[in-house]
């Protein structure tokens, strides 16, 4: 069963989350792509995606987020910026595929934004940054409005094989670990 | 500790195809990007592309699409680079090495297997 | 792709040395650059990432600075076991690259 799980980030304000979603090449390279928080009771909410059909290593930049999509590797790769501690919260990457339900991407992303200047770099695992030159050729791209009732967090149903899949349901595993994200100073 | 353990050297002849195997130890092998890296004899290292072993997911260089996979078997902890069409140009040292948290913009190899030597001769 | 090129190619110094390589970035690359050392016959090993932390384990006698498109990677007191071949690598945007390495051979 793909269990869906939940990975949580630390960071203070002003710094940039820097993740990557991973997926399959073959099947979703030009897909249009989105970034999304989910709110405990409520359906995700789509702050930004990529063009449609996505670019090739193309920025494209909301506000805050910058997303770049990177076909030939199988990863979507997004920024958000300059953190205030109001960012904090559960985010996910999902694929549109309409007429289909979007297609979530594990892992979803916990996180915790904390006020207060950071401290020396942790473990080389994660690198992360507080300042981000923003590409001065980045776009802003149209989201579809649809979102999946299936995603509310309320009620996560059970996992199967392809959460795809209209009947496909997640179950989120508890989040053990807390990574403490080096930072740039 | 940290291990990454490569097979053996290998010499085949142009056209054949060469599957390399990498098998990890001392952590979460799902939880890392493995990455593959190649060095021809006195030449500099070029990254080949990398895969995310939780789910299966790969990326290439251009310049390899088409002739390399990047695969797993998770219950064994251990991942494959295979190379197909080999020509002369191929014959180098493979390295797997380990990367950043999978979920994680990070490409920082901070273990990497002992590198396997590939020979394509005819 | 983003070009890295690594200056000199290669030196030679006593030991005691104060040893300095510079990796430039075709384009700003932020501070996405990593420092490998190999010895020959040998598989890199992670001296520094991030442009400027030290990998778990190595002497403090390596260090990195630099941001943007110059990078600067320094051994302050070069010693016999240093002999070796010195890459850098970025990664703020794919392909991953690596700069054609710097060989430091003792005087």
């Known amino acids: 069963a793909t269990k869906l799980t939940e990975e949580k980030y630390e960071l203070k304000e002003g710094q940039t989350l820097d993740v990557k979603c991973d997926y399959t090449l073959e099947k979703f390279a030009s897909s249009q792509k989105a970034w999304q928080i989910i709110r405990d009771g409520e359906m995700p909410k789509t702050l930004a995606c990529t063009e449609r059909p996505s670019k090739n290593s193309h920025p494209v930049q909301v506000g805050r987020i910058i997303l770049e999509d990177y076909h030939d590797h199988g990863l979507l790769r997004v920024r958000m910026v300059n953190l205030q501690v109001e960012d904090s919260g559960l985010y996910q990457c999902v694929i549109y595929q309409p007429p289909k339900e979007p297609h979530m991407l594990f892992d979803r992303i916990r996180l915790v934004v904390t006020k207060g200047f950071s401290g020396t770099p942790g473990s080389n695992e994660n690198s992360t940054q507080n300042v981000y030159k923003i590409p001065p050729t980045t776009t802003k791209a149209l989201c579809p409005l649809y979102t999946s009732p299936r995603t509310v967090t309320q009620a996560p149903p059970k996992s199967t094989a392809d959460v795809s899949t209209p009947d496909s349901e997640i179950n989120l595993t508890n989040v053990t670990d807390i990574i403490r994200v080096p930072v740039f100073n | 500790q940290v291990q990454l353990v490569q097979s053996g050297a290998e010499v085949k002849k142009p056209g054949a195809s060469v599957k390399v195997s990498c098998k990890a130890s001392?952590?979460?092998?799902?939880?890392?990007?493995i990455n593959w890296v190649r060095q021809a004899t006195g030449q500099g290292l070029e990254w080949m592309g990398r895969m995310n072993p939780k789910s299966g997911n790969a990326g290439y260089v251009q310049n390899f699409r088409g002739r390399v996979t990047m695969t797993r078997n998770t219950s064994i902890s251990t991942a494959y680079m295979e190379l197909s069409s080999l020509r002369s140009e191929d014959t180098a040292v493979y390295y797997c090495?380990?990367?950043?948290?999978?979920?994680?913009?990070?490409?920082?190899?901070?273990?990497w297997g002992q590198g396997t030597l590939v020979t394509v001769s005819s | 792709d983003i070009q890295m090129t690594q200056s000199p190619s290669s030196l030679s110094a006593s030991v005691g040395d104060r040893v300095t390589i510079t990796c430039q970035a075709s384009q700003d690359i932020s501070k996405h650059l990593n420092w490998y050392q190999q010895k020959p016959g040998k598989a890199p090993k992670l001296l520094i990432y991030?442009?400027?932390n030290l990998e778990t384990g190595v002497p403090s006698r390596f260090s990195g600075s630099g941001s943007g498109t110059d990078f600067t990677f320094t051994i302050s007191s070069l010693q016999p076991e240093d002999i070796a071949t010195y890459n850098c690598?970025?990664?703020?945007?794919?392909?991953?690259?690596f700069g054609g390495g710097t060989k430091v051979e003792i005087k």
């Open positions: 690598q970025q990664y703020d945007k794919l392909p991953l690259t």
């Open positions: 991030d442009t400027s």
């Open positions: 090495a380990r990367g950043g948290r999978t979920s994680i913009w990070s490409f920082v190899f901070d273990y």
């Open positions: 001392g952590y979460t092998f799902t939880s890392y990007d």
